[in-house]
């Protein structure tokens, strides 16, 4: 039961991570202009990955996307890599999970294959994770940069000819998303991996099975004996009567109406 | 059409108050900024007061900061100008006018005189 | 705040001439975000209100003559009328949109000689 908790709230929370992440990357609001210690401007100036912004006080906004890749600074280009890999390694690793879930039966798949299923989608989740926490910390490191720069040099030259007041940029709303979004991503992850250990069947061949005193009453059907041992796969046999043979497993191994989704 | 029309205007004793109202319509009032334009005897034009469109951010200058307040009715596409301890120098015509695409100004009413004199 | 020059205080022209005014403002209107100055011009004939002509400091609003045309950017802006008629003659001002307080220059009257 527990591993079935841990399991399925590693997925949901894997879940609730990529879809921040996803929600990230498209943003617009990565870097916002510093309005602090600022002239009071009636035009205010956001950048995402993909486009930058402006709103004025009118309530107009324009956006413009980034209609060039080699002209993008290299930092740039790598943080969108690093958010696109972490939503394609996080979407794989949903798709997985998924099937790994052990309230969910797919044919006769075995709990060694589901426990697989489940550390792969874990180290996915986790490497989705730090994908989007390094994105988001590389952009937030480069943005530290530029504003101590254009701090040290508040008055550039536009184009070399305009002089005026450089716009300074500090951190914008998807960058706490992202990092929110990558580390609930990375927990779900490392959720998924701790449920796997508990999917995992025993070393032994065999499952110790316990028998319980019968009367003359008991009717052991043929082939009942090997499907209490667990490892038959035609779950037909593998009801035996009362006072037979049983797993300590096959408790929960009868179908339920919670099985099935 | 795009309709502005101003009120309230009139003559008042130096340090009392006034109330000015501007009637909006042909236009999403509640989607638009709004400001407060005066015109000086000398024809100088000076904004008084902008809001924004959702009443999250108003702007006064110094000239007129602590005495003069810009609030809006978007249920009644009205916009008002709460003037109090009016200066003799508060003396000009008041335009209503809404902000448009570069923040320009691009409606204007037909303006109400104030006139501050003893 | 942004003091808005405005020169000549007025002009005296003839129908058919060619005008140009210009607006300096104390701080640079332009904005790195979209590139885009924010500078506007305004016409007031007597008794009316004031009537925006061109925003961002060369868009011509619509319904503006083409014969109106604003350029410059950052700090120096002018506005130039093609071709004066009779129905031009009226008080432009220039207004800083980018800085708050959003301030206007003092005006140049053109009359016709």
């Known amino acids: 039961m527990a591993v079935t908790a841990c399991q399925g709230l590693g997925f949901v929370v894997s879940l609730i991570g990529i879809a921040g992440i996803i929600a990230a990357t498209c943003m617009d609001q990565w870097s916002t202009q510093d309005l602090y210690n600022n002239p009071v401007t009636a035009v205010f100036n956001y950048q995402g990955l993909w486009r930058s912004c402006v709103r004025e006080s009118s309530g107009f906004t324009e956006c413009r996307g980034y209609f060039t890749l080699l002209g993008l600074p290299a930092m740039l280009q790598a943080v969108r890599a690093l958010m696109i890999v972490g939503i394609v390694l996080g979407a794989i690793g949903l798709l997985v999970s998924i099937f790994a879930l052990k309230c969910i039966r797919i044919g006769s798949m075995e709990d060694s294959a589901k426990a697989n299923m489940t550390l792969t989608s874990g180290i996915m989740f986790i490497v989705s994770g730090l994908c989007a926490i390094a994105g988001v910390s590389v952009f937030a490191n480069m943005l530290v940069t530029n504003f101590w720069m254009s701090t040290a040099n508040m008055y550039t030259g536009m184009g070399g000819m305009v002089q005026t007041v450089q716009t300074r940029y500090t951190f914008g709303a998807a960058l706490f998303v992202g990092w929110v979004a990558g580390g609930l991503t990375l927990i779900g992850g490392v959720m998924m991996c701790i449920a796997c250990r508990g999917l995992a069947p025993e070393e032994t061949n065999y499952k110790a099975v316990s028998y319980h005193a019968s009367g003359h009453s008991v009717a052991y059907k043929p082939g009942g004996f090997k499907a209490s041992t667990g490892f038959g796969s035609n779950t037909k046999n593998k009801k035996i009567y009362d006072g037979g043979a049983r797993t300590e497993d096959e408790v929960q191994s009868y179908p339920s109406k919670h099985d099935y989704v | 059409e795009v309709m502005l029309v101003e009120s309230g205007g009139g003559l008042v004793k130096p340090g009392g108050s006034l109330k000015l109202s501007c009637a909006a319509s042909g236009f999403s009032f509640s989607n638009s900024a709004m400001s407060w334009v005066r015109q000086t005897p000398e024809k100088r034009l000076e904004g008084v007061a902008t809001i924004s469109s959702g009443d999250s951010f108003t702007y006064y200058p110094d000239t007129v900061k602590g005495r003069f307040t810009i609030s809006r009715d978007n249920a009644k596409n009205s916009l008002y100008l709460q003037m109090s301890r009016l200066r003799s120098e508060d003396t000009a015509v008041y335009y209503c006018?809404?902000?448009?695409?570069?923040?320009?100004?691009?409606?204007w009413g037909q303006g109400t005189s104030v006139t501050v004199s003893s | 705040d942004i003091v808005m020059t405005q020169s000549p205080s007025s002009l005296t022209v003839t129908a058919g001439e060619k005008v140009t005014m210009t607006c300096k403002s104390s701080?640079?209107?332009?904005?790195?975000?979209?590139?885009?100055?924010?500078l506007t011009w305004y016409q007031q004939k007597p008794g009316q209100p004031p009537k925006l002509l061109i925003y961002?400091?060369?868009t011509r609003e619509s319904g503006v003559p083409d014969r109106f045309t604003g350029s410059g950017s950052g700090t120096d802006f002018t506005l130039t009328i093609s071709s004066v008629q009779a129905e031009d003659l009226a008080v432009y001002y220039c207004?800083?949109?980018?800085?708050?307080?959003?301030?206007f220059g003092a005006g140049t009257k053109l009359e016709l000689k």
């Open positions: 207004q800083n949109d980018y800085y708050y307080p959003l301030t």
């Open positions: 961002w400091s060369s």
């Open positions: 701080q640079s209107l332009l904005n790195s975000g979209n590139q885009k100055n924010y």
């Open positions: 006018a809404r902000q448009g695409y570069g923040n320009a100004l691009d409606y």
